[in-house]
Amino acid sequence: AWELTILHTNDVHSRLEQTSEDSSKCVNASRCMGGVARLFTKVQQIRRAEPNVLLLDAGDQYQGTIWFTVYKGAEVAHFMNALRYDAMALGNHEFDNGVEGLIEPLLKEAKFPILSANIKAKGPLASQISGLYLPYKVLPVGDEVVGIVGYTSKETPFLSNPGTNLVFEDEITALQPEVDKLKTLNVNKIIALGHSGFEMDKLIAQKVRGVDVVVGGHSNTFLYTGNPPSKEVPAGKYPFIVTSDDGRKVPVVQAYAFGKYLGYLKIEFDERGNVISSHGNPILLNSSIPEDPSIKADINKWRIKLDNYSTQELGKTIVYLDGSSQSCRFRECNMGNLICDAMINNNLRHTDEMFWNHVSMCILNGGGIRSPIDERNNGTITWENLAAVLPFGGTFDLVQLKGSTLKKAFEHSVHRYGQSTGEFLQVGGIHVVYDLSRKPGDRVVKLDVLCTKCRVPSYDPLKMDEVYKVILPNFLANGGDGFQMIKDELLRHDSGDQDINVVSTYISKMKVIYPAVEGRIKFSTGSH
């Protein structure tokens, strides 16, 4: 028998520095977790102790903190090279800055293979990108070879900016011939490494003949066997075992997100490359693991540029940006409108001639807006200003919801109106009218939404049975501020870009902003 140790990360999202337990900015260092310096310590410890070790990343290193905003992926290549990753799969967020924003900082600089079998380049891009990412790679490990085959969510064109010259094929259809090719090369130990979410990971394990292990990402799935060490609640045991259509037991793993854990999976293969056993658990990278001093020094060196960036002007406002709780928790506020407009703008994707855009709606809990911005400072807006407005380091995500769920969400928005509570919703692409004289749960008297399948966008009444795409904070997608109905009833959830980054990009693009209060949210009394 031959034993392989797979160390894996996914959805690190720019958490190069250690973070607090909830993966936001580290405040009390003695309680902080993750970060590449701490990760390196643990990886090196395992490399020294065990003979056959692979360090793999399942995508979405890009996007999530000011590190990505400033360094645009160069930080990913640099520190992944320093940690000596063996391979990485492309995630949807790797395309956030377009194909050039992937090629220049990462694909050209990585000293490890970057993989995806289901992304096919066409047109002039085909030659430009050829060989910079691969469908699979055969890695020598100890005295054996291991094949790693990559995959990426086929929803990427709706979630990021891959452009028109990359085709995202069905994962299973694309993976099978590549796995077959590896078999013809005499490679009998094959790992599928990719970024399509836990449901697809399980399908790959079930359907793709010849795949021995699946290492996934995208859905931030936390798996654990035994007593979990932190706040994350396991979605199943680690590894999660899938019985393939040809009767094999295929381990499937994922390691939550944000570099908080290092996935640790031990696989035993027989001489024919069949999995005999698999066991392990994610390792919580808490403060009991010291940060590696040389990586930490390098982080501190790179950090300097970030501090300079946060005080630079992004753009100007010529109006007061009212982000006060007195406004945003009670009525339409122009800071809410600005943020929602930025959220929609960040999700403009013309992927179908029938639609002007795939999504037109935004909702945002008023309690998530934490500060106004005064225009009387020469109108200057900096990253620092925006960090005061959006201090939680969240993301603006894409969900699919039924109209009936949205209606419930808007009822919840005003179910205890007047108490300055955070659930009052700011909106974009939505016109809502509330009648507060009615009893809670029956206060929404009009709810119109902006069409997407139209050449001239206009507002139509919400249909209860229709499925709508909505951009919202991850906080709401996870049921925060009492929006349990969103968490329970959402039909799809894809994590998006860092909240501050979305707004800062929009302001930089617009140069001068002047958001108004324009009647998105109205109140009526009596019969409507």
Epitope: K108, P113, S130, G131, P140, D143, V145, L185, N186
Partner: antibody, heavy 120, light 107 residues
């Protein structure tokens, strides 16, 4: 560290055959391919072919198909190339070079070369 | 076979100077290109693979770039040990082929 130790210089008569070796160390022999390259005096480089010591798959440059025979012995981590029906055109330095198993990135480490002189 | 046309065949330059060597591919090879260095004793070392990626241990003064079917190796500031021979090599399709080489000489 990776080392490719090639056998010593060969002097051969026209029409004869020579076999040269390339002993690999510092890595697992069957996890990489082995390529062979020819360089005539004062000239450029020509790729002869490669062997995968794991599957024993061989790919030749058509130009050398009837000239070179590639083999590998996994027990001694050694690759061999035999050149047959030698002519003065075969006088050259021959290099072995380690290649990627899957050929995506290729020929990262080179041997020091074996000089072959064909003379009557 | 894919022809790799390398230029110049020889180049005289001074210490500290910036120089670029170019290879043109007769067919599309994507980024499947290596740059090799050959010392006078015959020792061959790969400097760059996949057009852009520096091999470990290779000084940062070496860099690879591409414009369409033209591939370049640039040395930003020449040092004495750089005055040797350089070859490009494509590995996009069989048979692998090499450029004719560039002899870099000290002025």
């Amino acid at each position: 560290q990776v080392q490719l130790q090639q056998s010593g210089a060969e002097l051969a008569r026209p029409g004869a055959s020579v076999q040269m070796s390339c002993k690999a160390s510092g890595y697992i022999f069957t996890s990489y391919t082995m390529h062979w390259v020819k360089q005539r005096p004062g000239q450029g480089l020509e790729w002869i072919g490669y062997i995968n010591p794991n599957s024993f798959y061989i790919e030749y440059n058509q130009k050398f198909k009837d000239k070179a025979t590639l083999t590998a012995d996994t027990s001694s981590s050694t690759a061999y190339m035999q050149l047959s029906s030698l002519t003065s055109e075969d006088s050259a330095v021959y290099y072995c070079a380690r290649g990627d198993y899957d050929l995506f990135y290729d020929m990262d480490n080179w041997g020091q070369g074996t000089s072959v002189t064909v003379s009557s | 076979d894919i022809q790799m046309t390398q230029s110049p065949s020889s180049l005289s330059a001074s210490l500290g100077e910036r120089v670029s060597l170019t290879c043109r591919a007769s067919q599309d090879i994507g980024n499947s290109l290596n740059w090799l260095q050959q010392e006078p004793d015959g020792t061959i070392k790969r400097l760059i693979y996949a057009t852009f990626r520096l091999d470990s241990g290779v000084p940062k003064r070496f860099s690879g770039s591409r414009s369409g079917s033209d591939y370049s190796l640039t040395i930003s500031s020449l040092e004495s040990e750089d005055f040797v021979d350089y070859y490009c090599q494509q590995y996009a399709s069989f048979p692998w082929t090499f450029g004719g080489g560039t002899k870099l000489e000290i002025k």
